[in-house]
Interface confidence: medium
Amino acid sequence: FKVATPYSLYVCPEGQNVTLTCRLLGPVDKGHDVTFYKTWYRSSRGEVQTCSERRPIRNLTFQDLHLHHGGHQAANTSHDLAQRHGLESASDHHGNFSITMRNLTLLDSGLYCCLVVEIRHHHSEHRVHGAMELQVQTGKDAPSNCVVYPSSSQDSENITAA
């Protein structure tokens, strides 16, 4: 399996909410001995190996934000800790998983990584990640809504907040 990032760049105004998304592609084993660990973290731009550094998102580590379940099951992070920081990660039945960040500030700008680890009992792990950039803007030239730029082309499209 592999991870796809539908959008490589999110440009959002300060104070807006945004949902960063990754998608699990390819065959996914659904056996009893297979579970999936999905999480999010920040990383540094310009690394030789993108996403190799794991930094917290709003003081929450990748362990705090993880989802742990089998196959294409739906899951959400435990609400209390994450929601106090304006965060929520979620996963659906179709392999999509996301992190929602509320009330964006300029400090939220940066490179975000999603990580999927396939854990087979008595076997080795298989891990893949995806990366995307979030730019939070302020001032009269910041967009009114979050604008997302697809990974495959330069066309942009709006996520309508209202």
């Epitope: 300060e14 009269k140 009114s144």
Partner: antibody, heavy 118, light 112 residues
Framework: QVQLVQSGAEVKKPGASVKVSCKAS????????MHWVRQAPGQGLEWMGY????????EYNQKFKDRVTMTRDTSTSTVYMELSSLRSEDTAVYYC???????????WGQGTTVTVSS | DIVMTQSPDSLAVSLGERATINCKSS????????????LAWYQQKPGQPPKLLIY???TRESGVPDRFSGSGSGTDFTLTISSLQAEDVAVYYC????????FGQGTKLEIK
């Protein structure tokens, strides 16, 4: 550079309707909300409402809710503000203003004077 | 609706002197989550559309002279012109965008 060009002055009779246009250029039209603000002679600024050009979603000042309609044409990057059942108190300069990410009116049209007189 | 009240309605200040305009909102404009006040100041000269000066209560818009400054939080805000210039003669408006949008009634600034 960002430009908002509004339609010309209008003279209308009470009870009629007026439709003012605002053509945008120099930026991606669908990325920014457009607001309408009016100013009666010698008076202050009054926010009328906004339209999200991407979705067409509108939100209006309660004062104008039953009389105002804001629309957009993405093919020409133009927004429209129509005000119906005009009365003399609607005599004003009507401005379109582009929203920025800090909920700012950072760019304004030149204004359209609407005179309501019998 | 949030009501914005400016004071004074008009103000005459000598060239080179300080001008201060106040704006009070009927409820707090502070978003505590991002420590941001949804309050902006605009300048309008005769026959022209308004021009953005200050946003988020205290952030000066690019290109605006540094003699203009904004301060305050919550419900009480101030626009200060540290040394009045002839070109600063105008009407000044505060505007809230915390809950939809409302302008103050305006303050007319003249030279004494």
């Amino acid at each position: 550079q960002v430009q908002l060009v509004q339609s010309g002055a209008e003279v209308k009779k009470p009870g009629a309707s007026v439709k003012v246009s605002c053509k945008a250029s120099g930026y991606t039209f669908t990325n920014y909300w457009m607001h309408w603000v009016r100013q009666a002679p010698g008076q202050g600024l009054e926010w009328m409402g906004y339209i999200n050009p991407s979705s067409g979603y509108t939100e209006y000042n309660q004062k104008f809710k039953d009389r105002v309609t804001m629309t957009r044409d993405t093919s020409t990057s133009t927004v429209y503000m129509e005000l119906s059942s005009l009365r003399s108190e609607d005599t004003a300069v009507y401005y379109c203003a582009r929203d920025g990410g800090s909920v700012l009116f950072g760019y304004w049209g030149q204004g359209t004077t609407v005179t309501v007189s019998s | 609706d949030i009501v914005m009240t400016q004071s004074p309605d008009s103000l005459a200040v000598s060239l080179g002197e300080r001008a201060t305009i106040n704006c009070k909102s009927s409820q707090s404009l502070l978003n505590s989550g991002i420590r941001k006040n949804y309050l902006a100041w605009y300048q309008q000269k005769p026959g022209q559309p308004p021009k953005l000066l200050i946003y988020s209560a205290s952030t000066r818009e690019s290109g605006v002279p540094d003699r203009f400054s904004g301060s305050g939080s919550g419900t009480d805000f101030t626009l200060t012109i540290s040394s009045l210039q002839a070109e600063d003669v105008a009407v000044y408006y505060c505007k809230q965008s915390y809950n939809l949008y409302t302008f103050g009634q305006g303050t007319k600034l003249e030279i004494k």
